[in-house]
């Protein structure tokens, strides 16, 4: 008895092990930067200038529903979002033929470490409240990927993260930059 | 040849900042990203981030909790690492390391070090 | 933090003899696992990644394996140049991590 069974009041799946939901765009554009402090206790990852290149926990408060009946209080639930910067693809072009070249390995923001939370589930018409277990994630990590996963695990990610198609380069291509533009920051 | 030249040793009193320089040849700087690997006398190694020079996007390991800058500058094909605030214990030999690649295998490695900067925090 | 551990520390060896360092991660790593050789006061040099493809020009007698979370490095008939500190480094989980290293010297 899994947290596939629940369903928030959006009707919205809380997701389970191994799926990885795009959450909302945030509002607040500062709430992640590192002197703001706004970082949980085992946040992998921090992005000082807000940006793509960004691997967090975000918390998300909501009541879960199992039916005809809702918890009692409402759960907080964590979600592991963005990308784990800096970029490591980089567009590369010789004429008309493009591709994606690598500058490092790819790694992706997941789930590292859950926790078990019991939630009580209040029933209308005086029916007996129902106890469930729920399995909630508590940390994220930056995990490596490998060319072979698939690419549809990818599609909440931005456009330089995604894998290179078949016809890229086996190395890096040399392709020149500007010097140094704004600085993209993240701390593992 | 593809070598990493570092700038020369530092000595700092505690609080101040220090900036090391790595100057890359032999390869085309923004094809690989730099990363900087620390070692404390007698001790391991400690990896202290990463920074793209195409995009100057950085990343580093959150131990070092905003003390540290990673910058380039592609013009001279040269890397920085700045650390602010410095205490005793960030008394250390820093590398800059190019990482490469293995296209077959899809995996990377640290192929290419500079010398070595050592870096004393004393007062 | 993926924590490398290994072992043993340091270790005793004659030239000829065939020396194994083991190298065992907190979680698992899959093959993302390196191994260095460095010298005193010398940078670290690559000698295995992948967790057993030598580098071009490292002597065959090195050789690596393993999967997972427990990994080795065996030299199958130590050298006189052989005698140096080694680390295995993982690439699998940000941020990178490094073993504590092993110290092959001289008997």
């Known amino acids: 008895q899994g947290w596939q069974a629940f369903r928030n009041d959006a009707t919205e799946v809380i997701p389970g092990l191994g799926e990885y939901p795009e959450p909302p765009p945030e509002n607040n554009q500062t709430m992640n930067r590192a002197e703001n402090g706004g970082r949980p206790p085992h946040h992998p990852y921090d992005a000082k200038d807000v940006s793509e290149y960004s691997c967090r926990e975000l918390h998300y408060t909501r009541f879960l529903t199992d039916g005809p009946c809702r918890s009692a209080k409402p759960v907080t639930e964590l979600v592991c979002s963005g990308q784990c910067g800096p970029a490591r693809l980089l567009p590369n072009a010789i004429g008309r033929v493009k591709w994606w070249r690598p500058n490092g390995p790819d790694f992706r923001c997941i789930p590292d470490r859950y926790r078990a939370q019991r939630v009580q589930l209040l029933c209308p018409g005086g029916a007996a409240p129902r106890s469930r277990k729920v399995r909630l994630v508590a940390s994220c990590k930056c995990k490596r990927l490998t060319r072979f996963h698939n690419q549809s695990e990818l599609k909440d990610f931005g456009p330089e993260t995604a894998r290179p198609q078949k016809g890229r380069k086996p190395r890096p291509g040399a392709r020149g930059a500007k010097a140094n533009q704004a600085e993209l920051e993240n701390a593992y | 040849e593809v070598q990493l030249v570092q700038s020369g040793a530092e000595v700092k009193k505690p609080g101040a900042s220090v900036k090391v320089s790595c100057k890359a040849s032999?390869?085309?700087?923004?094809?690989?990203?730099m990363h900087w690997v620390r070692q404390a006398p007698g001790q391991g190694l400690e990896w202290m981030g990463e920074i793209n020079p195409n995009s100057g996007g950085a990343g580093y390991n959150q131990k070092f909790k905003g003390r540290v800058t990673m910058t380039t500058d592609t013009s001279t094909s040269t890397a920085y690492m700045e650390l602010r605030s410095l205490r005793s214990d960030d008394t250390a030999v820093y590398y800059c390391?190019?990482?490469?690649?293995?296209?077959?295998?899809?995996?990377?490695?640290?192929?290419?070090w500079g010398q070595g900067t050592t870096v004393t925090v004393s007062s | 933090d993926i924590q490398m551990t290994q072992s043993p520390s340091s270790l005793s060896a004659s030239v000829g003899d065939r020396v194994t360092i083991t190298c065992r991660a907190s979680?698992?790593?899959?093959?993302?696992l390196n191994w260095y050789q460095q010298k005193p006061g010398k940078a670290p040099k690559l000698l295995i990644y992948h967790t057993s493809r030598l580098l071009s020009g490292v002597p065959s007698r090195f050789s690596g394996s393993g999967s997972g979370t427990d990994f080795t490095l065996t030299i199958s008939s130590l050298q006189p140049e052989d005698f140096a500190t080694y680390y295995c480094q993982q690439g699998d989980t940000l941020p990178y991590t490094f073993g504590g290293g092993t110290k092959v010297e001289i008997k």
């Open positions: 390391a190019r990482l490469g690649y293995d296209d077959i295998y899809d995996d990377w490695y640290f192929d290419v």
């Open positions: 032999g390869y085309t700087f923004t094809d690989y990203n």
């Open positions: 979680q698992d790593i899959s093959n993302y």
